[in-house]
Structure formats: C-alpha cells, structure tokens
Interface confidence: low
C-alpha cells in the first residue's frame, strides 16, 4: 500500500485566524475532521470539492474543516482573529516565484518575459490552442495567468494577447534568486521551504518524521514559521529539517545579498578591549586560552578537526587565531594548539562593565570630545559634515562646526541623553553612543525639576463632538499584539507612532506583532466597523535604562472618531501634586470574571519624595520617573498592562504622562506606583518623529 | 514494564557484518526512538544511533558509512546492522529506549547487552 | 561534535561520605544532560536528567547540578551500592548523543 504523502508543508499556516466572505457568492466547504493534516490533503488533492481550494481553515474547537476557493489575498474576504481558528493557504497560490521550472506555479503574474499582455486560457483570440482549463485540471489554467502545465524548460509561460507573437515564456523568478541573506543568515525570515537537493522542508512544529528540539513556541524570536530554511543555531547558513525519513537535515540555497549589510537588530556591539554580554562582538586580538595556550588558527584543521572556517562563518570575523564567539557560546573561545584539548574558553578578557577608564561624558554630554564613533546598537557613525542639513533641521542655533569633527559621538543637539551620531543607515538615522556618565557626576540634566515653572499642557484644547466627549477619549490607546494575543498597552502619539514599554517584545521578528487600534474590547468584539489593525514596521528603542520603546507602524492609522493621537508633555515640564491621573489597561491577567473591556483606574499624582516615603524609603526616584498613587483599595496600574499610559488632564488638555513598566509595584493605598516619565524623554520622542522616515498613506 | 530483549552473534570476523535485533515488550513502541549503544572492554559509552515506529534514523557521523538501523513494528523489534567489522569494533552492544521529543534524549530502558567479539 | 569531559577519571570516597563528580561539555548543552550509573556486567541505569531531575526510583542522595557547560552530580551520603562507574551524556546538540568517558567511584 503506497503511503499516502502528508501535504501541510505546502501550506502557509498563520494561527488563530480565519477568513471572512465578505461576498455571498463566494463558496466555502465544510466537514467534521480531526487533524489539519486531513485538511490539507483533501485542499491538495480537491477530492469531494466543487471548486478549486486554495486555502483552508481548520476549527479546532469543533474539529472541523472550512475548506475555500480563495486566500486572503482575493477579493471579497477579509481576515479576522479566533482562537479556535488556523488559517493555511497553498504556498503556491501566494508565491511570486517559481520552484524548478515552474510546473506548480499558480500566482498572479500575466505579462511576458518581453511585456506583452497574456491570452486567457480559455480564450481562442487571437491564438487558437488545446491549453483548455478543462483539459488540464489541477494546473490552474485560470484567467490569463502564466503557467507551465507540462513542465517545460523555460518555465511559465503563456499566449501572448499579441497576434504576431504565439506564446512567449514569464519573466518570473527562481525562488533561490528572489531570496537571499546575509553574513550566515541568522536573521533570515524569507520563504525558502526546500533544500539544495530540492527536498521539501519539515514543518517546525512537526516531530515527523524527525524529531527535533527547534519548537516554534519554546523559540519565539528564531522565526519557525511553517517549514521555512532558517538557521537557529550558528551553522554556516539556514537550514531545515527535511520530509525524507533518511535525510535528517540539508542546508538551502540561499545566495547572499548584494549588500551583504547585517540588519541593525543583528549586529552585536564590537568591542576589542573587553567583552560585551556574550562576547559575540569580540573584535580584540587575544589568542591564548585562560590558561595560556595558544589558539589554533580559524583557517586551520590542524590539530583540530572543525567547519567553523571563515568561509563558513562570515561576519563573524575568524581572523588568524584570535579568541572569538562565533555560535552563542558563553564567551570567545577558540580551538587549541593542543591536541589533547579541542576547545578551551578565552576568560582572562575582561568584561566591558568591569573595565575601568571607560570614555564617560558629564552633564548630557554637550562637551564631549572623545574618539568613539560606533552607535549603541554597533553602527559605525557618518561623517558630521554629511548631515549638516538634517541636523539643522532639527536644531535652531548654529552647531559648534568646530566640536563636530570626522564622524565622533557629539552632542550639538543638546540631547538630554547624551552623545550621538549619524549613522548613514536610512532604516537608522541616528542612535546614540555606547558612553556613559561619569561616576559621581551629579549635573542635572533637567533643571528645576521640583518646581512647577514649565506647564505641562500646550494650548489645546481636548476635541468634542456635539458638545458630548466621543470614544476619542480612550481613541489613542492600542493592543499591542504578539502572535494574535495582546500582550501590551500602547498609546498612538502620532499617526504611524505608538510609545510603549521595552519589555513587551519577547521576539526579535516584527511579523510576530500587530498594533490593534479603535477598540474597546480586548478581543475585538462589537469593535469590528472601528477596529484597524497594523503591522509595525520597526521599533526604536529609547535612551539607556529608559524602559520605552517607538513602535513605527507600517502605515500611518485613519484618525476618526475611533482612532485619534495623545499628546506629549512639554519637554521637562512638572505635573502639581494632587493632579487627577488614570491608568488604562485590558488587565487580561488579573481578573476571574474580566469581561475583556479596556479598564481605567484613577490616580492622582504625588511628589518624588513623598512616593519615596511611601515605599518605605526602599525606593529611590530620580528626574526620569513619576509617581502616582491611589485612593481606593485595588486600583492601580497593576491592572492596567504594561506599555499603556498614565493620562493626566491640565488646561483641559489631556497628555500622556507616564509609561506603565514592569518591576516599580503596584498602585495599592500608601504604595504609589511608578512610572517612565515621559516628560524627561519628549525630546527624544520629537526628534524621533521628526528624523525617522514613515510610510505615506 | 518495559522490557528489551536483544540477541544475535556475538564472535565475527574482520570485514564480516554484525548484526542484532532487540525486541520490546510491554510500553507503547510507536512513541518512543530506539537506540543502539555500545561499549569496548573497559572503556565508556558510545551511541551508534537511532530509530523511531516509522523508519526515521540518525546515526553517529563516524559510524554513518557502515551502520543501517531497521524496525519491524510488525513485532515491536528494531535491528541494528554494522558492515565491514574490525577488531575496534569489539564491544558490549546495548539497545536502549530514548525519549520521543528532544528534551527525552536520554535512555530509561536498555537491553541486557550482547558481548561482540571481531576476531580472525 | 559536542565532546563531554568527566572529573576525575577515579574518586576515592569512605562509605557514608559525599562525592562530588564532574562533567564538562565543550559547549552549552543547557540543561539538556544525564546521569546514569554502570556496575560491572550491567547495563547502564538512569539517574538524572534535565541536569537535576532524579529519574523514577533514585534515593534522594543522589543530586545534580548544573547548566550550561559545566554539571555536577553529587552523592550526599555514600551507600556501598553506589561504588560504581558514572557516565554523564548530552542530548541537546545530536547527532550524534555523546558520552563522558566515566568517572570510577571506588572504595577509600
């Protein structure tokens, strides 16, 4: 009896979503299963369908299968949020590009290779042929699409509207060549799903046929989508499991970019004189072991046996024997010139937070004029005479041109957050330096903090509709959601901006999350005509220790009368004690009975040393925190969630005040809780908005 | 209770094949892999590789070339073949019971163990 | 391939004494390691696992330790049942499983 082939690894999976018709007409099928696995083979095979499927979803709450002639990407459907729902459509419906020769291409590209419009199949003007839909069932002989039913060399092709040119094959790409990685392809998350020898990849989150320690829920950030090539742990490039019981695991063709530049989030901090966190970074030129043998060199095989080669590591940089960390081990090691000991780990470097003589600045670092010219994140920075313009941009006074030379860490701008720099990075216009304050420097950044002098509020007033305040009073705040679950709060500052709280990115992999806007309900409910949904496009993280996070969206949110921004404090600005505040949250943690609506918990604000007082003298405030406290027993942020805001009023003019973040206690009587103060870093946040580029609508 | 019952020859010659077969009783042996693991005179262990219900094997890299893991779950037995035997390859060969998932790779059950003598 | 070092290769112990035995991976395992114990004619028999989590039927004498690359397994009160030979093994990186080459626990 011939195994019947298992087809879910030919399906995109997106979990805990389903499609919608939005148009009657469309069909749908169901029927009582018990795995997604019987979906999928009976969508593969079109057994028992009256139409084409194209995508399915499984139900698993009622163990049932709604099988579908269209994807997310057709028309008249939209998708939507279920738990109980996993959503898969056929890899080839969605694929731009084409697999060996293309015979299982089934995307929407209907030009020729030299621009001509394509024929429909079904059509016998202006060329007659015997490429009828009816006669070739299972190649999608739909519309006027390129396909290549046969499997012929050129791969997909079609006839041509053109009556003086027959058919003319698709200019569409190889899968290998539209992908492509850098340095070893750690951070890879293209939709490579076969290997070199052109085996089909295992899905990640199967366990057959191989076994394997690589759970897409035990590794969140490493980007086990379905069975796309990825290369979780430090092999010279991505790899999968594969669908043959006697290959284990192969590695894929992916080429390497063109500008082999390594991603931002990759890049760990470079440091030759010490060791940041792991080491990875480690650029320095020891290369003896603790104990004082010699390393063997990275290029060599003698007296050990090894694939960490440069060839095989690149960017990772195995120069001659130096002591290095090119897998995520503890620290750099390297092999020795021992042949009784293989590796050895390289701990007489010191650690980067234990070395002394460090560059440091005092005050906010305006007169700096040490040599680092590396951004916090490993950037190398750009010359200052290239950003002239962009600087004066933001700055109203003439920069001191004669501090700012080659491309240093400066601070012409007067951050508060001290020394910065240009990047040359378009995604990265600039970040600040890996320096810290001197120890012992007690120059207040801020001044006048303790009194009230600068008002919190600008002159505006808080918008009403027919005299009577719309949901835009809660319109600015946003579920942030990781994996279809809210796991933050948020508030929209700016149509593509959403301040919250560092701690709320567990994975590395943007895709992971969506900013849900206009709702009331934690799970959409009854929000479903006010609800936009958006993916984020990139997080900016804010000034060391400062707990915040920019969360850029992919595109600008419609602001109505659902969705509207917050306001920022005035840079520096004192809220009076005793000024009414609220928290907000969906507290989707807490609560037994929680009905899933957005809670507000009223606060008022108190004194840094008073709040001091209050925690029993265990807690020290300093300029870039405040505190509120509660009147009534079991309100709090606590209830609220992390990233969400403290909105206090003044003028009639509401403003985010504080950031919810996690380790400050809750707002419990005589325990204040505290927050990021948002006022301390509004600089920051303005200078972000104006010299980060956003998507248009 | 688990039990694993291996038998087969236990002297050979140089270039001969080896081979031993170990049945399980009692446990559920779809779930699990099944191992083989040996160990010269007076020395430690070394695993050769394994096999789950559905013929999926991995093997040692420095044993691959000569080494062909089957299972019969017909009889709820699994049988390890070594090609080409040298002296070195003389051992005490265990069948063992390892985990089903990744975190499991460690081995609750084993055989009594078959002495392998290659000797010309 | 992950290389496993045990330490030392003999432990001298009186009975109703501790042991201490040692096992050193070559790179992290994690927590991914056993334990297990081999008197003279027998088949191995598990002891620990996860690093610190004593398998079905092992006295609570026996504990273990450790993460990483560095892992201790450690006998609070010696029996005259525990003098044999113990073996660490690693399964977080495979294929292929790889052994420590055994440290003997003999009679002081």
């Known amino acids: 009896q011939r195994k019947r082939r298992n087809t879910i690894h030919e399906f995109k999976k997106s979990a805990k979503t389903t499609l919608i018709k939005i148009d009657p007409a469309l069909k749908i099928k169901t029927k009582k299963v018990n795995t997604a696995d019987q979906c999928a083979n009976r969508c593969t095979r079109n057994k028992g369908l009256p139409f084409t499927c194209k995508a399915f979803v499984f139900d698993k709450a009622r163990k049932q299968c709604l099988w579908f002639p269209f994807n997310s990407m057709s028309s008249g459907v939209k998708k939507e949020f279920g738990h109980e729902f996993d959503l898969y459509e056929n890899k080839d419906y969605i694929r731009n590009c084409i697999i060996g020769k293309g015979r299982s291409y089934k995307g929407t590209v209907s030009i020729t290779k030299s621009g001509i419009k394509c024929q429909p199949w079904s059509s016998m003007i202006p060329h007659e042929h015997s490429f009828l839909p009816s006669s070739y069932r299972g190649k999608d002989l739909q519309e006027n699409y390129c396909r290549n039913p046969r499997g012929e060399e050129g791969g997909p092709w079609c006839f041509t509207s053109n009556p003086e040119v027959r058919y003319e094959v698709c200019d569409i790409p190889q899968c290998s060549e539209v992908e492509c990685m850098t340095c070893n392809g750690e951070s890879y998350r293209g939709l490579m799903d076969h290997t070199e020898s052109g085996k089909i990849c295992q899905r990640w989150d199967h366990q057959t046929p191989h076994r394997h320690k690589f759970l897409p829920e035990r590794y969140p950030d490493k980007g086990f989508d379905d069975n796309y090539c990825r290369n979780p742990d430090g092999q010279p490039r991505p790899w999968c499991y594969t669908l043959d019981p006697h290959t284990r695991w192969e590695y894929c063709a992916i080429k390497t970019c063109a500008d082999n530049t390594m991603n931002d989030t990759d890049v760990p901090l470079e440091t030759t004189e010490c060791i940041q966190g792991q080491g990875e970074g480690y650029r320095g030129t020891v290369n003896t072991i603790w104990n004082g043998i010699p390393c063997q060199r990275w290029d060599s095989q003698y007296p050990h046996e090894h694939d960490m080669t440069p060839e095989n590591f690149k960017c990772k940089d195995l120069r001659e024997n130096y002591c290095r960390n090119p897998d995520g081990s503890e620290s750099p090691w390297c092999f020795t010139t021992d042949p009784n000991i293989r590796v050895g780990y390289c701990s007489q470097i010191p650690n980067c937070d234990m070395s002394h003589g460090q560059d440091c600045y005092r005050g906010n670092g305006k007169n700096y004029m040490g040599n680092l010219s590396q951004t916090r994140s490993g950037l190398t920075c750009s010359m200052w005479d290239k950003n002239m313009e962009d600087l004066h941009r933001h700055i109203f006074w003439e920069p001191d041109a004669s501090k700012l030379n080659e491309n240093y860490c400066r601070n012409p701008d007067d951050d508060a957050h001290g020394p910065w720099c240009y990047t040359g990075n378009p995604l990265i216009p600039w970040d600040y330096c890996p320096i810290s304050r001197c120890e012992g420097d007690t120059t207040p950044t801020i001044v006048n903090l303790d009194h009230p002098v600068i008002s919190c509020a600008k002159t505006k007033q808080l918008r009403v509709v027919n005299g009577i305040p719309t949901r835009t009073n809660i319109g600015w705040m946003v579920s942030l959601r990781y994996r279809n679950k809210h796991i933050c709060g948020g508030s929209l500052i700016k149509e593509s901006w959403v301040l919250t709280a560092r701690q709320c990115f567990p994975s590395r992999d943007l895709k992971d999350y969506e900013a849900w806007l206009g709702i009331h309900d934690v799970h959409g409910r009854g929000d479903e005509k006010c609800k936009q949904v958006l993916n984020v496009s990139q997080l900016v993280y804010g000034p060391e220790g400062s707990d915040l996070v920019l969360m850029k969206l992919a595109r600008p949110a419609v602001l109505d009368d659902f969705v509207s921004t917050i306001d920022l404090p005035n840079y520096g600005c004192t809220i009076p004690e005793k000024t009414s505040c609220s928290v907000y949250g969906w507290g989707y943690t807490g609560l037994i009975n929680y009905d899933g609506l957005l809670r507000v918990a009223h606060l008022y604000i108190m004194g840094n040393e008073k709040c001091s007082q209050h925690h029993r003298g265990k807690v020290t405030l300093n300029e870039s925190e405040i505190c509120a406290g509660a009147e009534k027993i079991g309100s709090g942020p606590c209830e609220g969630d992390y990233g969400g805001p403290l909105v206090c009023e003044q003028h009639k003019m509401r403003m985010v005040l504080g950031v919810i973040v996690p380790g400050r206690g809750c707002a419990i009587p005589n325990r204040p809780g505290i927050f990021v103060r948002v006022a301390y870093y509004a600089k920051w946040i303005h200078k972000i908005i104006l010299t980060y580029k956003v998507p248009q609508s | 209770q688990v039990q694993l019952q291996q038998w087969g020859a236990g002297l050979l010659k140089p270039s001969e094949t080896l081979s031993l077969t170990c049945a399980v009783y009692?446990?559920?042996?779809?779930?699990?892999?099944w191992s083989w693991i040996r160990q010269p005179p007076g020395k430690g262990l070394e695993w050769i590789g394994e096999?789950?219900?559905?013929?999926?094997?991995n093997y040692n890299p420095s044993l691959k070339s000569r080494v062909t893991i089957s299972v019969d779950t017909s009889k709820n037995q699994f049988s390890l073949k070594l090609s080409s035997v040298t002296a070195a390859d003389t051992a005490v060969y265990y069948c063992?019971?390892?985990?089903?998932?990744?975190?499991?790779?460690?081995?609750?059950?084993w055989g009594q163990g078959t002495l392998v003598t290659v000797s010309s | 391939e992950i290389v496993m070092t045990q330490s030392p290769a003999t432990l001298s112990v009186s009975p109703g004494e501790r042991a201490t035995l040692s096992c050193r991976a070559s790179?992290?395992?994690?927590?991914?390691l056993a334990w297990y114990q081999q008197k003279p004619g027998q088949a191995p028999r598990l002891l620990m696992y996860?690093?610190?989590t004593r398998a079905t039927g092992i006295p609570a004498r026996f504990s273990g330790s450790g993460s990483g690359t560095e892992f201790t397994l450690t006998i609070s009160s010696l029996q005259s049942e525990d003098f044999a030979v113990y073996y660490c093994?690693?399964?977080?990186?495979?294929?292929?499983?790889?052994f420590g080459q055994g440290t003997r626990l003999e009679i002081k």
């Open positions: 096999i789950n219900h559905s013929g999926s094997t």
């Open positions: 063992a019971r390892g985990g089903y998932d990744f975190w499991s790779g460690y081995y609750d059950y």
């Open positions: 093994q690693q399964y977080n990186n495979w294929p292929p499983i790889t």
């Open positions: 790179q992290s395992v994690s927590s991914n």
């Open positions: 996860g690093a610190s």
């Open positions: 009692g446990g559920s042996f779809s779930t699990y892999y």
